[in-house]
């Protein structure tokens, strides 16, 4: 069998949801000594980067300026050490947002409920779309999908304090082109006194894994390189 290097890790810097005309940055973390990285888009070569010096850098950033629907889709990356290529990374879905219109998000019976109540979110967008998406702040990977002509509903079932947080919805024109986000709706779930005081609220900062952990090795950073190599082996 043909020998290959371990697959790299692909990430979106800050977020995979990029407003149109803004820049997306994708990171491909491979290995120290990699002489070339390639970014592939929907199976075709998109961009190439050759780190300098290769032995000091464990990954690269690919910049995608002027985001639009032609650049939204599935990305992956590979790298090369000498003549040996790596396996392909996992796929990363890059989404363009702020297309067309802004939906309206509402919640029934209201934004303040008690634990155990049934809650339904409604996302409405009058322009032609059939797919709607609901996201919770700080949990942007957990996208709920629902379908409807101008409005979709998202039944949450009996809620707990874990459902507390800020929600937004999008209309989707295809899997990778989304509308402007709705205004946020903050759901407040109250439980009994003990539960309420202990229940943590979700972070409102972007997802912690949406960061690029690329390192530049210096003469004093051999231990960092070793740690990185060990960490990658653990991830595998």
């Amino acid at each position: 069998p043909k020998q290959t290097l371990p697959k790299p890790i692909i990430r979106a810097e800050s977020t995979y949801m990029v407003p149109k005309e803004k820049q997306a940055t994708l990171c491909c973390q491979g290995s120290y000594g990699a002489v070339e990285y390639q970014l592939h888009f929907e199976g075709s070569l998109f961009a190439v980067e050759r780190p300098k010096p290769p032995e000091r850098i464990n990954g690269v950033k690919f910049h995608i300026p002027d985001m639009n629907s032609r650049k939204a889709g599935r990305y992956s990356c590979i790298y090369r050490v000498g003549e040996l290529w790596s396996e392909r990374s996992d796929l990363l879905d890059l989404v363009v947002t702020e297309m067309y219109d802004t939906p309206t998000l509402s919640v029934h019976p209201g934004p303040e409920v008690t634990s155990g109540e049934k809650v339904t979110f409604y996302c409405r967008l009058d322009t032609a779309t059939s797919m709607f998406l609901l996201l919770k702040e700080g949990r942007s990977r957990d996208v709920q999908r629902s379908y409807g002509k101008v409005q979709a509903e998202f039944p949450m079932g009996p809620v707990t304090t874990a459902h507390r947080g800020s929600y937004r919805c999008f209309g989707s024109y295809n899997n990778y082109a989304w509308s402007f986000p709705s205004e946020p709706v903050k759901l407040l779930v109250t439980g009994d006194i003990e539960n309420t005081s202990l229940a943590p609220t979700d972070p409102t900062f972007p997802d912690s894994w949406d960061t690029c952990l690329l390192t530049r090795e210096t003469g004093l950073q051999k231990d960092l390189a070793l740690w990185d190599h060990t960490a990658q082996n653990l991830l595998r």
Epitope: A47, K52, D66
Partner: nanobody, 126 residues
Framework: EVQLVESGGGEVQPGGSLRLSCAAS????????MGWFRQAPGKEREFVAA???????YYAESVKGRFTISRDNAKNTLYLQMSSLRAEDTAVYYC????????????????????WGQGTLVTVKP
């Protein structure tokens, strides 16, 4: 706003050479990644060669060793030196730019480019 104007196209015999130029307006040229694409009659536009801000280059397999891409930031001009031309090189050649860009990315996919020239025709025939 970036404007790109190609020149240098024409008719040449097989085995001959041509140098295409692409003049860019604006002060963003040095920070742009650039590329050449071509479109033959009845075919899709295809990648030819690209160059990063720091002069790293990448070529399509079909032109490797025959074509050379280069840039002159002082003149705001991109070049494509074409030699050992073949009949299958006949096409309209387009210059394209990615603006702005950062780092040393070389862009190969046409979707990456946000500015395009009008094209210059290269015809290779005996």
């Amino acid at each position: 706003e970036v404007q790109l104007v190609e020149s240098g196209g024409g008719e040449v015999q097989p085995g001959g050479s041509l140098r295409l130029s692409c003049a860019a307006s604006g002060r963003t040229f040095a920070s742009a990644a650039m590329g050449w694409f071509r479109q033959a009659p009845g075919k899709e536009r295809e990648f030819v060669a690209a160059i990063s801000r720091s002069d790293d280059t990448y070529y399509a397999e079909s032109v490797k060793g025959r074509f050379t891409i280069s840039r002159d930031n002082a003149k705001n001009t991109l070049y494509l030196q074409m030699s050992s031309l073949r009949a299958e090189d006949t096409a309209v050649y387009y210059c394209a730019a990615v603006v702005p860009t950062y780092g040393n990315n070389i862009y190969v996919h046409s979707a990456a480019y946000n500015y395009w020239g009008q094209g210059t025709l290269v015809t290779v025939k005996p």
